[in-house]
């Protein structure tokens, strides 16, 4: 468990309930030892994960962990779906679990649904 393999700590079956029009940061927690790997985000389209090009991304450092962040400025209804980050480490590709964004379009929602309502979707 303390090996120097790159680890991508996106939780299996994780999700985020968010609203169109709001800003949102999707974080990929990355553990590495010496050299920070190259990390990318992709969006799932069926079984294919389509690489997200030209998007605003950044790094954040916390104690033992770095976070590769995908910025949504703002969230669009079309951002609904599942995302995965992957790291290029020693010429091997390490893929995270996918995380799902449930986007509520506030134009079509008379009021913002509660977290419980969104979680039950």
């Amino acid at each position: 468990k303390e090996s120097c393999d790159v680890q991508l700590y996106i939780k299996r079956q994780s999700y985020h309930s968010i609203f169109a029009g709001d800003p949102f940061k999707l974080e990929c927690p990355v553990k590495y030892c010496a050299h920070r790997p190259q990390v990318t985000w992709c969006k799932l389209n069926g079984t294919t994960c389509v690489k997200l090009e030209g998007r605003h991304t950044s790094w954040k450092q916390e104690k033992n962990l770095s976070f590769f962040i995908l910025h949504f400025e703002p969230v669009l209804p079309s951002d609904n779906g599942s995302y995965r980050c992957s790291a290029n480490f020693l010429s091997a590709i390490i893929e995270s679990h996918s995380t799902t964004l449930y986007v509520t379009d506030v134009k079509s929602a008379s009021e913002r649904p509660s977290k419980d309502e969104m979680a039950s979707r």
Partner: antibody, heavy 121, light 112 residues
Framework: EVQLQQSVAELVRPGASVKLSCTAS????????MHWVKQRPEQGLEWIGR????????KYDPKFQGKATITADTSSNTAYVQLSSLTSEDTAIYYC??????????????WGQGTTLTVSS | DVVMTQTPLTLSVTIGQPASISCKSS???????????LNWLLQRPGQSPKRLIY???KLDSGVPDRFTGSGSGTDFTLKISRVEAEDLGVYYC?????????FGGGTKLEIK
């Protein structure tokens, strides 16, 4: 080293509620799922549910919906389960367990020592 | 819910002899991501459970290699090549492919 600290025992009257705690050290619970598992005397294990402390999202086994409420406080690195309307059927050991996901898919990696809950008048 | 059925209920084994525990699920545990989320836990007397094996056959760190997990779909097996005194306790299989997560009823390993 990861440790999960739970209180040893609780004695509660029927009809009352109780809130059990589980404090993690050696790991930031924001990067994990925190689970609660029930074990009645001389019986097997039952999964109650889990929380994603990063965003408060919860999932419960339907049979514990309404009975258990799982919360987390990331500032104290602590997860809680509140059990309501207690009866003798709730007398059991309650374990917390910490699951984290990396590229090698670790989960249910660490368990607390359990809190023995006795419901008795 | 997925029902996990373990056999036997109790296993009485002489130290140094092999042991085998079966776990059958009521539906396939192969997930859409291609992985099978089947784990084995050991609960020693008076202790909390400890995971031995995850993803059917991967040994947790510190688990002796006399333990092996195998199987696919709905049929899984935990084998101990040579039982030692520290192996006694209750073994549980547990699935995390389908919601809600469910455990087998447990197999008690006794030393003869």
């Amino acid at each position: 080293e990861v440790q999960l600290q739970q209180s040893v025992a609780e004695l509660v009257r029927p009809g009352a509620s109780v809130k059990l705690s589980c404090t993690a050290s050696g790991f930031n619970i924001k990067n994990t799922y925190m689970h609660w598992v029930k074990q009645r005397p001389e019986q097997g294990l039952e999964w109650i549910g889990r929380i994603d402390p990063a965003n408060g999202n919860t999932k419960y086994d339907p049979k514990f919906q309404g009975k258990a409420t799982i919360t987390a406080d990331t500032s104290s690195n602590t997860a809680y389960v509140q059990l309501s309307s207690l009866t003798s059927e709730d007398t059991a050991i309650y374990y917390c367990a910490l699951t984290y996901y990396g590229s090698s898919q670790h989960y249910f990696d660490y368990w607390g020592q359990g809190t023995t809950l006795t419901v008795s008048s | 819910d997925v029902v996990m059925t373990q056999t036997p209920l109790t296993l009485s084994v002489t130290i140094g002899q092999p042991a085998s525990i079966s776990c059958k699920s009521s539906q396939s545990l192969l997930d859409s991501d291609g992985k099978t989320y089947l784990n084995w836990l050991l609960q020693r007397p008076g202790q909390s459970p400890k995971r031995l094996i995850y993803l059917v056959s991967k040994l947790d760190s510190g688990v002796p290699d006399r333990f092996t997990g195998s199987g696919s779909g709905t049929d899984f097996t935990l084998k101990i090549s040579r039982v030692e005194a520290e192996d006694l306790g209750v073994y549980y299989c547990w699935q995390d492919t389908h919601f809600p997560q469910t455990f087998g009823g447990g197999t008690k390993l006794e030393i003869k």
